[in-house]
């Protein structure tokens, strides 16, 4: 049993039928020695007397906010909640497995460029009776600070008889260095509590592997005298890195047509311009990836050829 | 190449060596999805890596107040990267193929030293510890982890260099 | 929490060959390399050699030609084996361990130590 | 061989006092592409194996009380005790890493006076 919060208690328990459960010992959190009951949530049921109450927790049953009162008053009170292990491995009930980038990847982590400020997400099916905490550090063994805010519900979606709920964070590194390499992964861990059950979901990585820029702004097209061809140009999305000399962007241009059988014509460039021929009902769409190091490219910006 | 002295390096062929080592880099290993590398035992090897750090003076600041801290900086990386893809854990079994861009990714790494390196001037001589004997089935995970470091390495250098060229250049 | 432990006669004829083994529990072999050091009775450490976590071997150029280290992975054990021993060779013998990496680190873990005199 | 050379050999310092042990290498143990320093420092006391202390010159083992701090680079390297304590008496060694064979000091006897 380990202390998540005051008064809140998470008892760790091997979940296997017939299996023994915890031992656990509450303590009243008061300087009375007599006269004290013990009552387990909205029941008035007596479940024992004296400043200590045991209990063997073996299932949801037991679990449950544990008050100890006198004479009709309310003294303290001590909630416990399970951590389910199943055959070793910790349950993960409350998130949803979003497969991207791989199995098991229930914390997916995006960053817009190098500040040390990042946005993770996550997806449930549960409604009610739903909390989230976060918590980040750089580093694990001696770690260096990350703020992050209160997790909230961004979207909602209907997926086929279900409705799915996805929840984000923002966090910002304390002491971010842009231009540094970096040599320890920021660790991002959020504690989720339904109803009960408590987990925990970790993610490991470095922003420059979560780097995925904003789209390219400003594009836009200006036709060549006599010619098929127009120059297009773009300029780096306000949210990138600065200076542009220094955290440079590639970019990639696309031609394509209105069918999507249509063959699309791609132009890698690191200028902010190029020159491509546009084909009538054609978009031409630009997206920017990092210069030097291969993370995400951007989601595309698009005008129409006409 | 760079003149001797404290002046600068050539900023342009340095810029565009970089900015190929960072291709050869991830040709030499493109990421396959996100690979976790965050097992047991990666801390020490990312640890024994070298890294620009935040106080190397390699951010645009740093470059413009004195460039030569970051860039023996960059120099030492070099070579102890060179060092590390020169030694039995590339060359050794199991062979990397034939047309592997690790030989290029070598030959560039000591090309671009050596634009650093400016004649008459010499940074202190580089010496590396004894590695650790590595066996075949060892060597493919850290051949992974210390190109995976790499690329990080070399997208800090590509951009000083870009930087540099770009507003540094006489 | 990793232990080392090792084992071997207390007592070896000089000319013979000194056997010892380090017993390891704790943790996965796989990730360790054992290194064997020594100490003469009030005098100071002395490095003998290593194997590492492939099975190779490194000693010391001073006791090359007499040593072999070796390792039995199903039994968690490495051996030491010291050939034609003299007085000189009657020491403390310890295993320590340091943690696989690049580069060979530090010994942070290390056996109780066992004292073998040679003597006829 | 690289030869680690400790000074002094024995030192004899009162409760409460601070203690310094120097460890000369040969040659230099910086790896300056990765910064490190490849010495470590140990403790040893009668009859037991000797403790890790400190390892990459100056970073402390966890669990070592922070009265030992280990400093110095390349040739030139000190283990400090701020504030003796009566456990401290013990025989410290300087051990390097960087190359075959591992070498170490001859060990310095730390006493109370």
């Known amino acids: 049993i380990w202390e998540l919060k005051k008064d809140v208690y998470v008892v760790e328990l091997d979940w296997y039928p017939d299996a023994p459960g915890e031992m656990v010992v509450l303590t009243c959190d008061t300087p009375e020695e007599d006269g004290i009951t013990w009552t387990l949530d909205q029941s008035s049921e007596v479940l024992g007397s004296g400043k200590t109450l045991t209990i063997q927790v073996k299932e949801f049953g037991d679990a449950g906010q544990y008050t100890c009162h006198k004479g009709g008053e309310v003294l303290s009170h001590s909630l416990l909640l399970l951590h389910k292990k199943e055959d070793g491995i910790w349950s993960t009930d409350i998130l949803k497995d979003q497969k991207e980038p791989k199995n098991k990847t229930f914390l997916r982590c995006e960053a817009k460029n190098y500040s040390g400020r990042f946005t993770c997400w996550w997806l449930t099916t549960i409604s009610t009776d739903l909390t989230f905490s976060v918590k980040s550090s750089r580093g694990s063994s001696d770690p260096q600070g990350v703020t992050c805010g209160a997790a909230t519900l961004s979207a909602e979606r209907v997926r086929g008889d279900n409705k799915e709920y996805e929840y984000s964070v923002e966090c910002q590194e304390d002491s971010a260095c842009p231009a540094a390499e970096e040599s320890l992964p920021i660790e991002v861990m959020v504690d989720a509590v339904h109803k009960l059950k408590y987990e925990n979901y970790t993610s490991s990585f470095f922003i420059r592997d979560i780097i995925k820029p904003d789209p390219p702004k400003n594009l836009q097209l200006k036709p060549l005298k006599n010619s098929r061809q127009v120059e297009v140009s773009w300029e780096y999305p306000d949210t990138w890195s600065t200076p542009h000399s220094y955290f440079s962007l590639t970019f990639c241009v696309q031609v394509q047509g209105k069918s999507k059988r249509e063959k699309k014509d791609r132009v890698f460039t690191d200028k902010t311009s190029a020159t491509v021929i546009c084909r009538k009902n054609a978009s031409i769409s630009v997206r920017a990836q990092d210069r030097y190091y291969s993370s995400s490219w951007s989601e595309w910006a698009s005008v129409p050829c006409s | 190449r760079a003149v001797p002295g404290g002046s600068s390096p050539a900023w342009t062929q340095c810029q565009q060596l970089s900015q190929k080592l960072c291709t050869l880099a991830w040709s030499a290993h493109p990421l396959v999805g996100h690979m976790d590398l965050r097992e047991e035992g990666d801390e020490e090897t990312t640890n024994d890596v070298p890294h620009i750090q935040c106080g190397d003076g390699c951010d645009p600041q740093g470059l413009r107040d004195n460039s030569q801290f970051c860039l023996q900086r960059i120099h030492q990386g070099l070579i102890f990267y060179e060092k590390l893809l020169g030694s039995d854990i590339f060359t050794g079994e199991p062979s990397l193929l034939p047309d592997s861009p690790v030989g290029q990714l070598h030959a560039s790494l000591l090309g671009l030293s050596q634009l650093l390196q400016p004649e008459g001037h010499h940074w202190e001589t580089q010496q590396i510890p004894s590695l650790s004997p590595s066996q075949p089935w060892q060597r493919l995970l850290l051949r992974f982890k210390i190109l995976r470091s790499l690329q990080a390495f070399v997208a800090v250098a590509a951009r000083v260099f870009a930087h540099g060229a770009a507003t540094l250049s006489p | 929490q990793v232990q080392l432990q090792e084992s071997g006669p207390g007592l070896v004829k000089p000319s013979e060959t000194l056997s010892l083994t380090c017993t390891v529990s704790g943790g996965s072999i796989s990730s360790y390399n054992v290194h064997w050091i020594r100490q003469p009775p009030g005098k100071g450490l002395e490095w003998i050699g290593v194997?590492?976590?492939?099975?190779?071997?490194d000693y010391n150029p001073s006791l090359k030609s007499r040593v072999t280290i070796s390792v039995d992975t199903s039994k968690n054990q490495f051996s030491l084996k010291l050939s034609s021993v003299t007085a000189a060779d009657t020491a403390v013998y310890y295993c320590a361990r340091d943690k696989y990496g690049l580069f060979p680190g530090y010994f942070d873990y290390w056996g109780q130590g066992t004292l073998v005199t040679v003597s006829s | 061989d690289i030869v680690m050379t400790q000074s002094p050999d024995s030192l004899a310092v009162s409760l409460g006092e601070r203690a310094t042990i120097n460890c000369k290498p040969s040659q230099s143990l910086l790896s300056s592409g990765n910064r490190k320093n490849y010495l470590a420092w140990y403790q040893q006391k009668p009859g037991q194996p000797p403790k890790l202390l400190i390892y990459y010159a100056s970073t402390r083992q966890s669990g070592v009380p922070d009265r030992f701090s280990g400093s110095g680079s390349g040739t030139d390297f000190t283990l400090t005790i701020s504030s003796l304590q009566a456990e401290d008496v013990a025989v410290y060694y300087c051990l390097q890493h960087f190359n075959y064979p591992w070498t170490f000091g001859q060990g310095t006897k730390l006493e109370i006076k």
């Open positions: 194997i590492w976590t492939g099975g190779s071997t």
